[in-house]
């Protein structure tokens, strides 16, 4: 028998430094987690502990920080390669800067293989790409070999900047042909390394035949045996046995997200690659686990940029932007619209003729915008002054919702009004209209959308059984300030890009901003 | 029918470098391992370097480490051995030689081609 | 490095006849051992691999079998075009040691 170690990331979104404990800025470094400098400790003890290591990467190092906003990838090349990756599946944030954004800083850096078997590439960017990603790679592992094959999720158009040259297919479809052409090469023993989320990566060990372990990525799945070790609660034992079609049992596995955990998988594999036992569990990289003092200088060497581009103007605003909790919690703000507007901009895709885009809607609530900022500064916005409107470091993304779990969301933003209460919503559009003299549950009176299907937009009654995507943030996809309707009734989740990215990025390409309100949430009946 | 033919064999004088190559025909060279052996003149055999399929890792004997590099160019079906400080210990025949499954065999052999190294 | 000994240095044997080649290693090789047969003036031919494997081509009089340290080539009965000489190959961490070679020649 031989054991193969795998440890591995996923959706680590620019967490380069420690972080606190929900994965935001770190306060209190004592209790602070995670970060590459910790995460190189916690790496080179086992490979100097076990024969047969792998450590990988399933994708999402680009967005989330202002590591990201600053460095644009570079950063993620720089700090894999010290850390010594062995591979990497593309997730659909690495395409946020296109694919230019993708080649130049991550592709043409990284020391190792980059990989997805299911994006081609066509037209001209073909020869450009070409031999920058693989579909798989084959890798020595102490005496023996492991095969690792790369998919990436096909909603990636949907969810980020990938361009017209490249075609995502079907995740299984793609694989197949790799795997057996591995198992034609005599590569006995495949990892599957990609970025589709659980439910894809439990599809995958199931459907393809040959993959003896999937790591995923995508959904930021908490999986783990026995009592957890922090906040997350596990979706399931780590790792997840799935039985394939053709009757192996097959471990999935995922790490959360943000750096906080790093996977630990120990496969025992027979003489002719098939798996006998697998066991592990995340191990939740706390302040137990000293930072390694040479990584960590790297990390401060490269801090000192980022301290100074938080001062630099990123644009001008010519109207005060009112993101005071006075207005943002009781009435329609235009911090609230500047932000939603922001929210759309940010995922403008013209995936299809039919569509104008393929999402017009953005709810946002109130109690998220933490600051306004004065005009009266020269109009000046730095990314200091957005990190005062929004200072949790969430990011805003895309989910799909019937229309009548919108319509209790917004039944919700005005159920205890006038309380100064978060969950007031703002919004992009949509045009919303409450009677406060009704009783809670029932005050809602009009509810116009945006359409999508369309080449002239304009606003349509909701109707309360189609499906609609709508732009987030995280924090209400999750269920937070009591829009628990969102999170259960939710039919798709996907993680999009930082909250102050998306803002900053609209106000620098507007270069003046001058956000109104202009009767996107209104009142009925006098009552207000 | 798979196919190794080297070229670029020679006499050098110690201290100088030479270059082998070897064409690869009649099966996907791209997805294959590469490794150079050499016989001395009425010795055995001696394995000299081995390239990873797509030119991502290499290994050398310790006999040869620093003085030689192993390369190989995928588009042209191409394997080369740059020789450097070359010693008389390195005179011998250099056989091509195809890995057929991770180090497990090494299936198909070129002719060789003769390296003297004499002053 | 594993060194690999090969025993006997000659075997001479007439044309029918069973040969029995060893091969031995300094330390264990796994499952990772390979046999070549070389002729005067030409390439060795791949005969066996991963310790019993024949190779493509290979008469069924060739056989290979042992694990660990200790190896054996069997050619059952001595056809002429077996007369050549018989190298063992390992394989440990991606190094490679041939043997120092079989010669078997015609009593």
């Known amino acids: 028998a031989w054991e193969l170690t795998i440890l591995h990331t996923n959706d680590v979104h620019s967490r380069l430094e420690q972080t606190s404990e929900d994965s935001s800025k770190c306060v209190n470094a004592s209790r602070c987690m995670g970060g590459v400098a910790r995460l190189f400790t916690k790496v080179q003890q086992i490979r100097r502990a076990e024969p047969n290591v792998l450590l990988l990467d399933a994708g999402d190092q680009y967005q989330g920080t202002i590591w990201f906003t600053v460095y644009k990838g570079a950063e993620v090349a720089h700090f894999m390669n010290a850390l010594r990756y062995d591979a990497m599946a593309l997730g659909n944030h690495e395409f946020d800067n296109g694919v230019e954004g993708l080649i130049e800083p991550l592709l043409k850096e990284a020391k190792f293989p980059i990989l997805s078997a299911n994006i081609k590439a066509k037209g001209p960017l073909a020869s450009q790409i070409s031999g920058l990603y693989l579909p798989y790679k084959v890798l020595p592992v102490g005496d023996e070999v492991v095969g690792i094959v790369g998919y990436t999720s096909k909603e990636t158009p949907f969810l980020s900047n990938p361009g017209t040259n490249l075609v995502f297919e079907d995740e299984i479809t793609a694989l197949q042909p790799e795997v057996d052409k591995l198992k034609t090469l005599n590569v006995n023993k495949i990892i599957a390394l990609g970025h589709s989320g659980f439910e894809m990566d439990k599809l995958i060990a199931q459907k393809v035949r040959g993959v003896d372990v999937v790591v995923g990525g995508h959904s930021n799945t908490f999986l783990y045996t026995g009592n957890p070790p922090s906040k997350e609660v596990p979706a399931g034992k780590y790792p997840f046995i799935v039985t394939s079609d053709d009757g192996r049992k097959v471990p999935v596995v995922q790490a959360y997200a943000f750096g906080k955990y790093l996977g630990y998988l120990k496969i025992e594999f027979d003489e002719r690659g098939n798996v006998i036992s697998s066991h592990g569990n995340p191990i939740l990289l706390n302040s137990s686990i000293p930072e390694d003092p040479s990584i960590k200088a790297d990390i401060n060497k490269w801090r000192i940029k980022l301290d100074n581009y938080s001062t630099q103007e990123l644009g001008k605003t010519i109207v005060y932007l009112d993101g005071s909790s006075q207005s943002c919690r009781f009435r329609e703000c235009n911090m609230g619209n500047l932000i939603c507007d922001a929210m759309i901009n940010n995922n403008l895709r013209h995936t299809d003729e039919m569509f104008w885009n393929h999402v017009s809607m953005c709810i946002l609530n109130g109690g998220g915008i933490r600051s306004p900022i004065d005009e009266r500064n020269n109009g000046t916005i730095t990314w200091e002054n957005l990190a005062a409107v929004l200072p949790f470091g969430g990011t805003f993304d895309l989910v799909q919702l019937k229309g009548s779990t919108l319509k209790k969301a917004f039944e919700h933003s005005v159920h205890r009004y006038g309380q100064s209460t978060g969950e007031f919503l703002q919004v992009g559009g949509i045009h919303v209209v409450y009677d406060l003299s009704r009783k809670p549950g029932d005050r809602v009176v009009k509810l116009d959308v945006l359409c999508t299907k369309c080449r002239v937009p304009s606003y349509d009654p909701l109707k309360m059984d189609e499906v609609y995507k709508v732009i987030l943030p995280n924090f209400l996809a999750n269920g937070g300030d009591g829009f628990q309707m969102i999170k259960d009734e939710l039919l798709r989740h996907d993680s999009g890009d930082q909250d102050i990215n998306v803002v900053s990025t609209y106000i620098s390409k507007m270069k003046v901003i001058y956000p109104a309100v202009e009767g996107r949430i209104k009142f009925s009946t006098g009552s207000h | 029918q798979v196919q190794l033919v080297e070229s670029g064999g020679g006499v050098a004088q110690p201290g100088r470098s030479l270059s082998l190559s070897c064409a690869a025909s009649?099966?996907?060279?791209?997805?294959?391992?590469m490794h150079w052996v050499r016989q001395a003149p009425g010795k055995g055999l001696e394995w000299v370097a081995l390239?990873?399929?797509?030119?991502?890792?290499?290994y050398y004997a310790d006999s040869v480490k620093g003085r030689f590099s192993i390369s190989r160019d995928n588009s042209k079906n191409t394997l080369y051995l740059q020789m450097n400080s070359l010693r008389a210990e390195d005179t011998a025949v250099y056989y091509c030689v195809r890995d057929g499954q991770w180090g497990s065999r090494l299936d198909y052999w070129g002719q060789g081609t003769l390296v003297t190294v004499s002053s | 490095e594993i060194v690999l000994t090969q025993s006997p240095a000659t075997l001479s044997l007439s044309p029918g006849e069973r040969a029995t080649l060893s091969c031995r290693a300094s330390?264990?090789?796994?499952?990772?051992l390979a046999w070549y047969q070389q002729k005067p003036g030409q390439a060795p031919r791949l005969l066996i691999y991963d310790a019993s494997n024949r190779a493509t081509g290979i008469p069924a009089r060739f056989s290979g079998s042992g694990s660990g340290t200790d190896f054996t080539l069997t050619i059952s009965s001595l056809e002429p075009e077996d007369f050549a000489v018989y190298y063992c190959q390992q394989r440990s961490n991606w190094i490679f040691t041939f043997g120092p070679g079989t010669k078997v020649d015609i009593k």
């Open positions: 009649g099966f996907t060279f791209s997805d294959y391992g």
């Open positions: 330390q264990s090789v796994s499952r990772y």
């Open positions: 390239i990873w399929y797509d030119g991502s890792f290499e």
